[in-house]
């Protein structure tokens, strides 16, 4: 594959990363799946300066981002070390709340409506964000 | 547990606008996670989304009944209500508050669900 | 006429497996997650699947749900009296930009 160089059309570039912001809701392994196809993954947040940039664009709307604990701990989905990483979860969160009553737990990460993080039943039509980097190597085959 | 209950007038007069309370107790209505919305049953008949308004007021209607509804919240009361202005015979049925676990702009699934008002309009 | 299609009724004996189908299209069903309701006689309908396949708890592991392309459909094994009741589907609808129901299955337990 070749280096992408420039982010695709309707895609915000910053920080050497490229962003997508969707406008209707999925659920969180339906939006992964989507991201995926698009050759990204859901948004991965390493810093306070990209949750600002992330939060800025989605404004105050429940969005899910590449974070999830289904196989027991906490993994960001490219691989990221969560234990070392940015964190920004509202208070008492993560709960993993059993509570809603619509069996098992919470389990996928989400930006609230302030930008801190809560774990929600994974299920749940939010939107969501994928994030590519401009500096790997895309799948798509060279131009000649 | 989250419990919702309907509460308004039985009888409405034909023309005249139908006006109803969903109290939410059990849970806070500006948690944010949820919307709530208003559902109505004719007798005998299937379920008809009206609309759901979310705790900072936004609001989606179906686009039927649109010209007529209006949803507000009172987050300091812990519910929101329903108004249904020139109504006719063809608004009479049971009216159901329910908790929609959809994100910003989509529905999720409906639950709970209030017990449900009968409103029959008539003269 | 509602946007989903459901059978007006459907029946069988205990024991049996009954399943209640629900026809939609790529704006509704074809697009997003469907869920199952169930309204026993003389009271509110309650959530008995959400997001195609997923159970409430307290919901028996006898309903299951499943969805492929714009239909989805409902399927009760080991199907008791208690079961009798209206069964409604509902999705998003793109359309409509907002949730939409099917007519209802009335099911009977001979």
């Known amino acids: 594959g070749s280096e992408r160089t420039c982010c695709p059309v309707n895609w915000v570039e910053h920080e050497r990363s490229c962003y997508w912001f969707s406008r209707s809701g999925k659920a969180w392994a339906d939006a992964d799946n989507y991201c995926r196809l698009e050759d990204a993954h859901l948004v991965v947040v390493t810093s306070w300066e990209e949750q600002k940039f992330v939060q800025h664009h989605i404004g105050p709307v429940n969005t899910w981002m590449g974070l999830h604990d289904q196989n027991g701990p906490w993994k960001w989905v490219d691989g990221t070390d969560y234990e070392t990483g940015f964190k920004n979860w509202r208070p008492e969160q993560p709960d993993d709340w059993y509570g809603h009553g619509l069996g098992g737990g919470e389990d996928c990460a989400h930006f609230t409506d302030d930008g801190r993080w809560n774990d929600d039943v994974c299920q749940r039509p939010y939107r969501w964000v994928c994030e590519t980097e401009l500096d790997k190597a895309s799948q798509e085959p060279p131009l000649l | 547990q989250v419990q919702l209950q309907e509460s308004g007038p039985g009888l409405v007069n034909p023309s005249q606008t139908l006006s109803l309370t969903c109290a939410v107790s059990g849970g806070s209505i500006s948690s944010g996670y949820y919307h709530w919305s208003w559902i109505r049953q004719h007798p005998g008949k299937g379920l008809e989304w009206i609309g759901y308004?979310?705790?900072?007021?936004?609001?989606y209607y179906n686009p039927s009944l649109k010209s007529r509804v209006t949803i507000s919240v009172d987050t300091s009361k812990n519910q929101f209500s329903l108004k249904l202005t020139s109504v006719t015979a063809a608004d009479t049925a049971v009216y159901y508050c329910?908790?929609?676990?959809?994100?910003?702009?989509?529905?999720?699934?409906?639950?709970?669900w209030g017990q449900g008002t009968l409103v029959t309009v008539s003269s | 006429q509602s946007v989903l299609t459901q059978p007006p009724s459907a029946s069988g004996t205990p024991g049996q497996r009954v399943t209640i189908s629900c026809s939609g299209s790529s704006s509704n069903i074809g697009s997003y997650a469907v869920n199952w309701y169930q309204q026993l006689p003389g009271t509110a309908p309650k959530l008995l699947i959400y997001s195609n396949n997923h159970r409430p708890s307290g919901v028996p592991d006898r309903f299951s749900g499943s969805k492929s392309g714009t239909s989805a459909s409902l399927a009760i094994s080991g199907l008791q009296s208690e079961d009798e009741a209206d069964y409604y589907c509902?999705?998003?609808?793109?359309?409509?930009?907002?949730?939409?129901f099917g007519g209802g299955t009335k099911l009977t337990v001979l």
């Open positions: 509902e999705a998003w609808d793109d359309s409509l930009n907002g949730p939409v």
């Open positions: 308004i979310y705790y900072s007021g936004s609001t």
């Open positions: 329910a908790r929609d676990w959809g994100g910003y702009d989509s529905s999720g699934w409906f639950d709970p």
